[in-house]
């Protein structure tokens, strides 16, 4: 596979990663698929510095990130360890709230209007952020 050395058109470079900020909404799973189709993943926040960068670009708008607990424990989509990694939850979050009346709890994480994180119903059509790392092999599979 080839290595990506610069960001695609309409993506923003920051600290050797490329970011794409949606201006419309999708459910978490659809946003996840969208990023995969862009050879990227939903944003994985690994530091306070990255948090501030993303927050600056999305503004005060609910926005999906690549963090969910749909299979039990909280997991980042790229395999980054959740327990030892950066977190920025709102107070008393995540709470897996069932009171929304939509069925089930809350299994997907998003940036809230102040940038801190909340868990919410994965079907809500929020904006999202895709991220891909520079200098990473493109994972192009061999042709059979």
């Amino acid at each position: 596979g080839s290595e990506r050395t610069c960001c695609p058109v309409n993506w923003v470079e920051h600290e050797r990663s490329c970011y794409w900020f949606s201006r419309s909404g999708k459910a978490w799973a659809d946003a996840d698929n969208y990023c995969r189709l862009e050879d990227a993943h939903l944003v994985v926040v690994t530091s306070w510095e990255e948090q501030k960068f993303v927050q600056h670009h999305i503004g005060p708008v609910n926005t999906w990130m690549g963090l969910h607990d749909q299979n039990g424990p909280w997991k980042w989509v790229d395999g980054t360890d959740y327990e030892t990694g950066f977190k920025n939850w709102r107070p008393e979050q995540p709470d897996d709230w069932y009171g929304h009346g939509l069925g089930g709890g809350e299994d997907c994480a998003h940036f809230t209007d102040d940038g801190r994180w909340n868990d919410d119903v994965c079907q809500r059509p929020y904006r999202w952020v895709c991220e891909t790392e520079l200098d990473k092999a493109s994972q192009e599979p061999p042709l059979l």
Partner: antibody
Framework: EVQLLESGGGLVQPGGSLRLSCAAS????????MSWVRQAPGKGLEWVSV????????FYADSVKGRFTISRDNSKNTLFLQMNSLRAEDTAVYYC???????????WGQGTMVTVSS | DIQMTQSPSSVSASVGDRVTITCRAS??????LAWYQQKPGKAPKLLIY???SLQSGVPSRFSGSGSGTDFTLTISSLQPEDFATYYC?????????FGPGTKVDIK
């Protein structure tokens, strides 16, 4: 000029296999996800599959999952659709199409006809 | 899967007429909607994306509107080359799905 040109269609018996190709020109092929869309005779459009620019991610319609495989060779600007276990209901014109960030298809090939019949 | 329906299934009109085609999604798709034109024996052609954005090179007599579940394609003044079949398509989620089509023919 941006262009897509499909080939590989033809007549095949039920249970048989066929491999379609789509040659792309006029744009940076590896930068775009590509898709296959089909149209049965006298019917509407049906999305079949899509593949990311690197080929690392693929998605399929339930009607073809496990039977069709989408792939690409970016060094040759070519998209493929390997079709196995073909059925009569797979008879259609198969179009390759370039996907945009709005999740729509802005460039289409002229189509290649696949007929599955004994 | 998101089901797309279109109405009418066919419409007879004259050159100069205003033609309106509607498309409805079985669930909300915000503005993840496109419109295509297809002529017999030809590939579809993208007219409108993101519900209301006109594709480059498409005449301004074509316009799109709507959001959520209900969308409209309008041809303000029908031209001879506009007689064709029109399809809507949702790009909100996999599988991408198309409407059944609306045929615009000569009255």
């Amino acid at each position: 000029e941006v262009q897509l040109l499909e080939s590989g269609g033809g007549l095949v018996q039920p249970g048989g296999s066929l491999r379609l190709s789509c040659a792309a020109s006029g744009f940076t092929f590896s930068s775009y996800a590509m898709s296959w869309v089909r149209q049965a005779p006298g019917k509407g459009l049906e999305w079949v599959s899509v593949i990311s620019g690197s080929g690392g991610s693929t998605f399929y319609a339930d009607s073809v999952k496990g039977r069709f495989t989408i792939s690409r060779d970016n060094s040759k600007n070519t998209l493929f659709l390997q079709m196995n276990s073909l059925r009569a209901e797979d008879t259609a014109v198969y179009y390759c199409a370039k996907r945009t960030p709005e999740d729509v298809f802005d460039i289409w090939g002229q189509g290649t006809m696949v007929t599955v019949s004994s | 899967d998101i089901q797309m329906t279109q109405s009418p299934s066919s419409v007879s009109a004259s050159v100069g007429d205003r033609v309106t085609i509607t498309c409805r999604a079985s669930q909300g798709i915000i503005s993840w909607l496109a419109w295509y034109q297809q002529k017999p024996g030809k590939a579809p052609k993208l007219l409108i994306y993101a519900a209301s954005s006109l594709q480059s090179g498409v005449p301004s007599r074509f316009s799109g509107s709507g959001s959520g579940t209900d969308f409209t394609l309008t041809i303000s003044s029908l031209q001879p080359e506009d007689f064709a079949t029109y399809y809507c398509q949702q790009g909100n989620s996999f599988p991408f799905t198309f409407g059944p089509g609306t045929k615009v023919d000569i009255k």
